[in-house]
Interface confidence: low
Amino acid sequence: VPGEAEQPAPELVEVEVGSTALLKCGLSQSQGNLSHVDWFSVHKEKRTLIFRVRQGQGQSEPGEYEQRLSLQDRGATLALTQVTPQDERIFLCQGKRPRSQEYRIQLRVYKAPEEPNIQVNPLGIPVNSKEPEEVATCVGRNGYPIPQVIWYKNGRPLKEEKNRVHIQSSQTVESSGLYTLQSILKAQLVKEDKDAQFYCELNYRLPSGNHMKESREVTVPVFYPTEKVWLEVEPVGMLKEGDRVEIRCLADGNPPPHFSISKQNPSTREAEEETTNDNGVLVLEPARKEHSGRYECQGLDLDTMISLLSEPQELLVNYVSDVRVSPAAPERQEGSSLTLTCEAESSQDLEFQWLREETGQVLERGPVLQLHDLKREAGGGYRCVASVPSIPGLNRTQLVNVAIFGPPWMAFKERKVWVKENMVLNLSCEASGHPRPTISWNVNGTASEQDQDPQRVLSTLNVLVTPELLETGVECTASNDLGKNTSILFLELVNLTTLTPDSNTTTGLSTSTASPHTRANSTSTERKLPEPESRG
């Protein structure tokens, strides 16, 4: 063709896959009449007629472009729809008149790859491998043209390095003409790479310019030998009896070695293996003082059979022993004195307190409690509390009962009980003394006795209210070796409508809707109003 040697470079048209390419025929009016043009595609030096323009009307030629071509811009532009990678070629338009001239267009096609998919080597990498091992694989699917891959470790790009870093990339062409890129990063890793973050980046071009996509970051399992094993105890800090204590072995190797935890036998100083749970943790629950001692961990590498021993760790389970009080069961006459002494052992310094059991009142801070001029009221429970102030919750207690010799002492001297005729009453009478008294009643009924504490007794009587009983009342008598004492219960009739009898006379309420011979509670211990206790 005349003048072909001076052909200018083709015009570049860039378009993304799937969009429409506008191929504008750049022939000037002097070079040819645009109403009479032939369009060709050039592939491997071969021209193929794909479209004719005659008198401004376009006609597709049969073939691969038949359905995708149309004329635009008054016939100066050929529109190619649904562009594919196979469309990346030269298109030319050729004017027929006044003389044959042609205009060349280079169509460039682009497609962004999908997000890169990174897969780490699940088997991991030993640090002492002789040559680079596969770290991860990066796949970028359906890009055009082939994207470039850059590998990063901890944000820094990795370069090929002999015997250290090797990047092996390959690509496949899909039936769509798009490329799938696979890049394998191989590297020799060191122990410090156990936390290294690797990712790959795909660099690609679009008509709008250069772009990139990054994969997620991954870490690769790195295997390195154990250099040190050690013990860890939870909770941290002072331990006490009753705590849940966990002793676990840890190692700086991956995978960790097979662990066994031993406790030194205090008599032979030999290590005796302890039974751990499925996770290799020795659980002491509840911890006891016998668990104190020297523990160590052995880590056995099952591949090399190399065994490592931890530094021994002393475990101290703090304790307070059983508290002993002397005398253990004191008995005293009224007016005499008593010294109570409390003793206990502990792994730490102890504090002692004496409390009155009935009231919780602190009587003494120290191991010795002195009681002088003992009165009957001084009888009862005294509790010694031995505690370790530096370890909250570590304490033991012992209760001692002080008995004051004396005749029975009644909880009340006399009392009114409001009743209805023919009800079964439940009466109660309480007395204390040392020796502990027994209680008898002056009427027939079902009586039962309960020991409240070493000096106190409670007797209950079930009795049917009769006219005679209303007249005589009920007496309970408490007796011991040192004497006897009596309480009287006066029975008063009450109407069913009476809710609260005269507050000056009552100390117990006995209303009931029960029919004859049913039980109503009318106990001498059930009080609506306070009343000073009467002494016998």
Partner: antibody, heavy 121, light 107 residues
Framework: EVQLLESGGGLVQPGGSLRLSCAAS????????MSWVRQAPGKGLEWVSA????????YYADSVKGRFTISRDNSKNTLYLQMNSLRAEDTAVYYC??????????????WGQGTMVTVSS | SELTQDPAVSVALGQTVRITCQGD??????ASWYQQKPGQAPLLVMY???NRPSGIPDRFSGSSSGSTSSLTITGAQAEDEADYYC???????????FGGGTKVTVL
Amino acid sequence: EVQLLESGGGLVQPGGSLRLSCAASGFTFSSYAMSWVRQAPGKGLEWVSAISGSGGSTYYADSVKGRFTISRDNSKNTLYLQMNSLRAEDTAVYYCARDVYGATSSVFDFWGQGTMVTVSS
Amino acid sequence: SELTQDPAVSVALGQTVRITCQGDSLRLYYASWYQQKPGQAPLLVMYGKSNRPSGIPDRFSGSSSGSTSSLTITGAQAEDEADYYCSSRDTSGNHLVFGGGTKVTVL
């Protein structure tokens, strides 16, 4: 009563092989590590090799490593020492001993009577 | 690692004799002591901090300090005449070592 009885000793030429056995009774064999200890004529005791109760771990003195192999058959209550590439300096009485392996010490609390191995051309 | 013992000591009948064993491994591990009479297998006489197997007379006692371990026979008897060997794990913890032995003669 704990008893250990060695057998398999004898005269062998340098470079030859020998297999020693130690039959154990009177205790739970698999619960104890076992060791071989030797004593050259007129010399002191020398530890040779040890094996854990399960047989999973084995240990060797540097002087025999690569030539001797310790093993055990817990079903037969028997300890073995396979000796290959024997040298004149391996000539000794070989004792098997029960090895009480603690964290702070190792104790041979029971010993066999020994079997004599002579390596000579 | 090595354990060092005096080759020989003598003691008058009824007197006290102390045999020592030295080595770096004894900073980490206790020694065990064995008695061996001519033509017999060794016999364990002391192990751990100061533990005596049953059947061993209480005239045998043990002690340990730093890199030295000692076996003491208080009131030596004629039947105590024998070679005594100390033993320990080596510093690696996996191997066993014996001392060269001490010949005790009861005069």
